[in-house]
Interface confidence: medium
């Protein structure tokens, strides 16, 4: 139990779409501010966002040290203007999150097709190595640098003409697909980690068809 | 429940191949990379190999990868280990196992006993 | 490749004892470290992955930690049924290897 005017926070959320991470909750603040607070199972506690009336906080910061570490984050409350103020323990009150481990959950990212370039019958289309906000000596680190084979892309491609989805795969960032000549198609990509249980795949990116600039045609 | 059954043991003679397969049950068959380890009597586990069974894709342990082919079966959700020109040290239990997603091995087989003795 | 260092191979303890077992990698391998514990004549079983992470079903008592090349596996306390060989693995990068086995018994 806290001070009589001051709320724990709750429905703490993580939302992380490629590693950017941020913990969301409720209530807005009524005459309180939040102190945030993040941590690996075996660490110690470090405070973020410091007495703000916000109800979210970003701990990218955090996460990409090492996102295949569990992290737990708890938001503490305070009344406004008298922040040394605690609970009838001693403590100021809190409320834990869910665990939360970055490698396993965060969400996929819509992909974006880069290119696709048409040579003969054969059409190579590229998908954007999306950059991560994961840090190794000192550069971002791609979307590809950090999951290697436990991503994979998903092609779907149709003619212009026609509404009948083919697909293909691929662990690289590249795909190598036979058209018929003669024929625009258009197509769209989704990033999938198959051996997920959760946030497998991302949506759908943007459609581009043959025709238009991103692509480029040789005989 | 996911199930990875394999074949019954061998022996086979020094300078013979044999083909161990490792049928998978319980679960998206082509999601997770299948994985060979294999184990001396006595001793520890040597990982041998990996396969893709979405694209029959392979990466072997530089040391077998003149004598070890991984090969996969789709319309039966079964991959298979050769090893050639087999020799005495080759004796051991071979075991397949299902790569969880990050890299630990999270299903393992039964084992096959592989006997190389003339 | 990346040599992995277990120690020690083999130990005693009694039944509610703290048990420890260590893994060096000969380079950083970050988190990229698994335990599995395997039981004579049967398969490897996975407990630990992400150096501390316990896997579906495993009890309380298995724990792993460590980072970059220094890791620990500890049984809290330890019972009758955990009489086998463990093992640490690296995930972290091609070829997988593993540690040379800690065999623990009963006193």
């Known amino acids: 139990s806290g001070t009589t005017n001051t709320v724990a926070a709750y429905n703490l959320t993580w939302k992380s779409t490629n590693f950017k991470t941020i913990l969301e909750w409720e209530p807005k603040p009524v005459n309180q501010v939040y102190t945030v607070q993040i941590s690996t199972k075996s660490g110690d506690w470090k405070s973020k966002c410091f007495y703000t009336t916000d109800t979210e906080c970003d701990l990218t910061d955090e996460i990409v040290k090492d996102v295949k570490q569990t992290y737990l984050a708890r938001v503490f409350s305070y009344p406004a203007g008298n922040v040394e103020s605690t609970g009838s323990a001693g403590e100021p009150l809190y409320e834990n999150s869910p665990e939360f481990t970055p490698y396993l959950e965060t969400n996929l990212g819509q992909p974006t097709i880069q290119s696709f370039e048409q040579v003969g019958t054969k059409v190579n289309v590229t998908v954007e190595d999306e950059r991560t906000l994961v840090r190794r000596n000192n550069t971002f680190l791609s979307l590809r640098d950090v999951f290697g084979k436990d991503l994979i892309y998903t092609l779907y491609y149709w003619k212009s003409s026609s509404s009948g989805k083919k697909t293909a795969k691929t662990n690289t960032n590249e795909f190598l697909i036979d058209v018929d000549k003669g024929e625009n198609y258009c197509f769209s990509v989704q990033a999938v980690i198959p051996s997920r249980t959760v946030n497998r795949k991302s949506t759908d990116s943007p459609v581009e068809c043959m025709g238009q600039e991103k692509g480029e045609f040789r005989e | 429940e996911v199930q990875l059954v394999q074949s019954g043991a061998e022996v086979k003679k020094p300078g013979a191949s044999v083909k161990v397969s490792c049928k998978a049950s319980?679960?998206?068959?082509?999601?997770?990379?299948m994985n060979w380890v294999r184990q001396a009597p006595g001793q520890g586990l040597e990982w041998m190999g990996e396969i893709n069974p979405s694209t029959g894709g392979s990466t072997y342990n530089q040391k077998f990868k003149a004598r070890v082919t991984m090969t996969v079966d789709q319309s039966t959700s079964t991959v298979y280990m050769e090893l050639s020109s087999l020799r005495s040290e080759d004796t051991a239990v071979y075991y397949c196992a299902r790569r969880e997603l990050g890299g630990p091995f999270g299903y393992w087989g039964q084992g096959t006993t592989v006997t190389v003795s003339s | 490749s990346i040599q992995m260092t277990q120690s020690p191979s083999s130990l005693s303890a009694s039944v509610g004892d703290r048990v420890t077992i260590t893994c060096k990698a000969s380079?950083?391998?970050?988190?990229?470290i698994a335990w599995y514990q395997q039981k004579p004549g049967k398969s490897p079983k996975l407990l630990i992955y992400f150096a501390s992470n316990r896997y579906t079903g495993v009890p309380s008592r298995f724990s792993g930690s460590g980072y970059g090349t220094d890791f620990t596996f500890t049984i809290s306390s330890l019972q009758p049924e955990d009489i086998a060989t463990y093992y640490c693995q690296q995930d972290y990068s091609s070829p997988w290897t593993f540690g040379g086995g800690t065999k623990v018994e009963i006193k």
């Open positions: 319980g679960y998206s068959f082509t999601g997770y990379y």
């Open positions: 380079q950083s391998v970050s988190q990229g």
